[in-house]
Structure formats: structure tokens, C-alpha cells
């Protein structure tokens, strides 16, 4: 926990943030909580970002106060106004940009005192992979596709039957730049697959890790995928 020290005779209050990651082009949340106050009008929330001339967001006297907001964040920020009274100062950030990454400060003033905590926000692109059987190929082949990643991830194949096997010699991965010139489509092909086996396509960068599984039997194909954000930790 990072505790902001009180000044002018006020006590310090505890402010807690959680490091998180934003998916560019989508909406993100910068999490921040504090010791609640009984009067909404006594609560001031300020979000600041290292390297930004103006404020990211300010909420005071029960409403947004955006006269000092930086142009880079204009129209893209909101707090959860109905949850401020219970100590939620989290910020919703619309249309996350790559350049939104950095160190943010959640600064709180209440009738009890003042406090702040920093938050490291990472940005990138991450998406669920889908693994399919490639029926067009000459041999039994699997194709793993994920539409949006940034920075460029690593792709590793694994198999339930051949645990620990290295599939780099029998796989081929390509990265195709998407139209907005930042994110990339990931395509990885695995050759010489065997029936009655479960294969996993694991895609990972410093923001997220995603896995697509496929189980191929004589009678059916079962798929499953999941995505996990990395390095989410509380301050």
C-alpha cells in the first residue's frame, strides 16, 4: 500500500491502486480505491499522468471538473460517479491509445485527509487465439489465428501427448500488420499433427498471455481458449 501523507493538519488516508493493462482501441479501467467519506461534496479525485501537462481527470463537489484537463484526454475519461461515495475512484479510459501507457497518480482529498498512489499502466493489443484444423493442407495441419497483438508476441506450440516436445521445427509463424499500422495479426501453422491429441497454441507478450487449445479425435473436435493479463499487482 502507498499512503499519502497529510498536510495542513489533515490526516493521511489510504489510497490503493492496481497495475493494469489496456487493449488499444478498446476501453480500459485504471483502478483506484480509498477510505470512503460520508459526504460526496467533500471528495476530490485527481488523476495525473507522468509527462502530461494537464490533468487526466478531476472530480470534485460531486461532478467532473475538467477545466484543467489535458487535451490528450479530452472526451475519453470518466469516473464511476455513483461509486465515489463508497471509495471507488477508478477511471474509465475510452479508446485506449498506445501512448496512454505510463505512470498515473490517483490523488484523493476527503474530509479525513489526503492520500495518493501510483499506478503503472501498460498498453498493447491482445486477443483470443482460435485453433482450427486446416483441411486445405496436404498433411494433418493446425492453424492458430489471433487478430490483434502488440508488441510482437512469441508463439509456442505444445501437446498433451508429447509434453516437453519442441515444435519449432514443425511450425511456422507469421505476423501481418493490420490496417492501422500498429497491431498485427498472428498466424501460426503446426504440421504433422496426430489424431487423439490435444494441442495448445500459446501466444505471449509482456502485456498478456493467451492460449488456444484444440482436441482432435476421430469423432469430434473440441476447442477452448483463454487470455490472462500479466503483471497486475496492487500498490
Amino acid at each position: 500500500l502507498i499512503i499519502g501523507f497529510g498536510i495542513s493538519g489533515r490526516h493521511s488516508i489510504t489510497v490503493t491502486t492496481v497495475a493494469s493493462a489496456g487493449n488499444i482501441g478498446e476501453d480500459g479501467i485504471l483502478s483506484c480505491t480509498f477510505e470512503p467519506d460520508i459526504k460526496l461534496s467533500d471528495i476530490v479525485i485527481q488523476w495525473l499522468k507522468e509527462g502530461v501537462l494537464g490533468l487526466v481527470h478531476e472530480f470534485k463537489e460531486g461532478k467532473d471538473e475538467l477545466s484543467e484537463q489535458d487535451e490528450m484526454f479530452r472526451g475519453r475519461t470518466a469516473v464511476f460517479a455513483d461509486q465515489v461515495i463508497v471509495g471507488n475512484a477508478s477511471l474509465r479510459l475510452k479508446n485506449v491509445q498506445l501512448t496512454d501507457a505510463g505512470t498515473y497518480k490517483c490523488y484523493i482529498i476527503t474530509s479525513k485527509g489526503k492520500g495518493n498512489a501510483n499506478l503503472e499502466y501498460k498498453t498493447g493489443a491482445f486477443s483470443m487465439p482460435e485453433v482450427n484444423v486446416d483441411y486445405n493442407a496436404s498433411s494433418e495441419t493446425l492453424r492458430c489465428e489471433a487478430p490483434r497483438w502488440f508488441p510482437q508476441p512469441t508463439v509456442v506450440w505444445a501437446s498433451q501427448v508429447d509434453q516437453g516436445a519442441n515444435f519449432s521445427e514443425v511450425s511456422n509463424t507469421s505476423f501481418e500488420l493490420n490496417s492501422e499500422n500498429v497491431t498485427m495479426k498472428v498466424v501460426s501453422v503446426l504440421y504433422n499433427v496426430t489424431i487423439n491429441n490435444t494441442y495448445s497454441c500459446m501466444i505471449e507478450n509482456d502485456i498478456a498471455k493467451a492460449t488456444g487449445d484444440i482436441k482432435v479425435t476421430e469423432s469430434e473436435i473440441k476447442r477452448r481458449s483463454h487470455l490472462q493479463l500479466l503483471n497486475s499487482k496492487a500498490s
Epitope: G51, L53, G54, E68, E71
Partner: antibody, heavy 118, light 107 residues
């Protein structure tokens, strides 16, 4: 069209003071952050100070902190840099720079020369 | 402070050449980087912001790329009016810092 016009430069003795002004037009001045960037003769660019659109948040290069003060008058569309305790190493062309919609170094004035010499 | 190491400091090239200038930041800057062009006796002019975005009116022969701490400005086919000095600038952290500049001269 965005226009930034600096004035107030000149020759000043070491230890002296000078106030630079930058008159802005062609955009909603109060919405945008502004900076001063300087360039010593024959040298590269150096950011000196910045201020947000509302004027409440100011930032400085360590070597000018306590000597320079950035301010703005949004009613007059004017940015200022009050410089005191000037040193020979402050000699440079001082540029007024405006933030655009996405970026802090979008629009540049033509610069005003400050020479600190005895 | 974030140090911006720009290379080369100067280069000689001919009209039509492809020119590449790089900037390395002393830490990751998440594409908070711009590229500027300056001609002798003139104020700098913004070319690229956020690492890859072209300013309005800047010819498409200019492009930016990179991520993390390493960024590149490319001029795909050098034109006579492109002979100038180019600077990168980071705005991820105060104080904002510039690269040392790259002077592009006629061969």
C-alpha cells in the same frame, strides 16, 4: 491558421532579467498546453518549461527551476516566460510551442534570441 | 531524465535515396515520441507524433516506426527539400528531452 509570435528577447547582462511573450492566434488557446523550447547557437533543442491549458500546472527543466517562471493569460491568448538570474548558458533562441490535438510539439513560433553577456 | 540517443549525427545522401534515422531512449517511452525537421535559420516543424502518426500536410515518404525504447524515422525517397536537420523528442516523462539531431546533407 495557428500563429505563435514571440517577443521580448534581447541582450541582457549576467544576473539580469527578461520577460518573453508569445502571442497566439488561430486556435482555442485555453484548451492547449504550451512549452518554451530553446536552442543555443549551433546546438540542439532543449525543452525549458511547460504549462497546461488552464494554467494551474507548470513544469521546468532542473537548471532553470527557481529562476524562470512560465505563465499564461488565457484572456489575452498570451504565454509568458519570466527569466531572472540569467547566465551565459541561457543564451539561445527561445521558441514558443503549442500542443495540438495529439501532441505537445505541434506548432512552433519563429523564435526570439536571448543573449546573456557582459 | 530520459536520454535520447540519436544516430547518425550526420549523413550524406542523394536525391532518391532511402534514409533511416534512429533514436534510442534510455527507458521505454511507449511511442510517446515525435520527429521534427529543422532547416537553417528556421523554427522546427513537426513531422510525426506518437511514433508513427504523420502530421497533416507531411508527405507520405516520411514514416515512423518502433516500440519500447527504439524508434526510427524513414524517408523512403529523399527529395531536395528534405535536406535539413532532424530531431526526435520524447514526451513520456518530464523533462521532455530531444535527441542530438541528425544533419542530412547532399552527397
Amino acid at each position: 491558421e495557428v500563429q505563435l509570435l514571440e517577443s521580448g528577447g534581447g541582450l541582457v547582462q549576467p544576473g539580469g532579467s527578461l520577460r518573453l511573450s508569445c502571442a497566439a492566434s488561430g486556435f482555442t488557446f485555453s484548451r492547449y498546453g504550451m512549452s518554451w523550447v530553446r536552442q543555443a547557437p549551433g546546438k540542439g533543442l532543449e525543452w525549458v518549461s511547460g504549462i497546461n491549458g488552464g494554467g494551474s500546472y507548470t513544469y521546468y527543466l532542473d537548471t532553470v527551476k527557481g529562476r524562470f517562471t512560465i505563465s499564461r493569460d488565457n484572456a489575452r491568448n498570451t504565454l509568458y516566460l519570466q527569466m531572472s538570474s540569467l547566465r551565459a548558458e541561457d543564451t539561445a533562441v527561445y521558441y514558443c510551442v503549442s500542443q495540438g490535438s495529439n501532441y505537445y510539439f505541434d506548432y512552433w513560433g519563429q523564435g526570439t534570441l536571448v543573449t546573456v553577456s557582459s | 531524465d530520459i536520454r535520447m540517443t540519436q544516430s547518425p549525427s550526420s549523413l550524406s545522401a542523394s536525391v532518391g535515396d532511402r534514409v533511416t534515422i534512429t533514436c534510442h531512449a534510455s527507458q521505454g517511452i511507449s511511442s510517446n515520441i515525435g520527429w521534427l525537421q529543422q532547416k537553417p535559420g528556421k523554427a522546427p516543424k513537426a513531422l510525426i507524433y506518437h511514433g508513427t502518426n504523420l502530421e497533416d500536410g507531411v508527405p507520405s515518404r516520411f514514416s515512423g516506426s518502433g516500440s519500447g525504447a527504439d524508434y526510427t524515422l524513414t524517408i523512403s525517397s529523399l527529395q531536395p527539400e528534405d535536406f535539413a536537420t532532424y530531431y526526435c523528442v520524447q514526451y513520456a516523462q518530464f523533462p521532455y528531452t530531444f535527441g542530438g539531431g541528425t544533419k542530412v546533407e547532399i552527397k
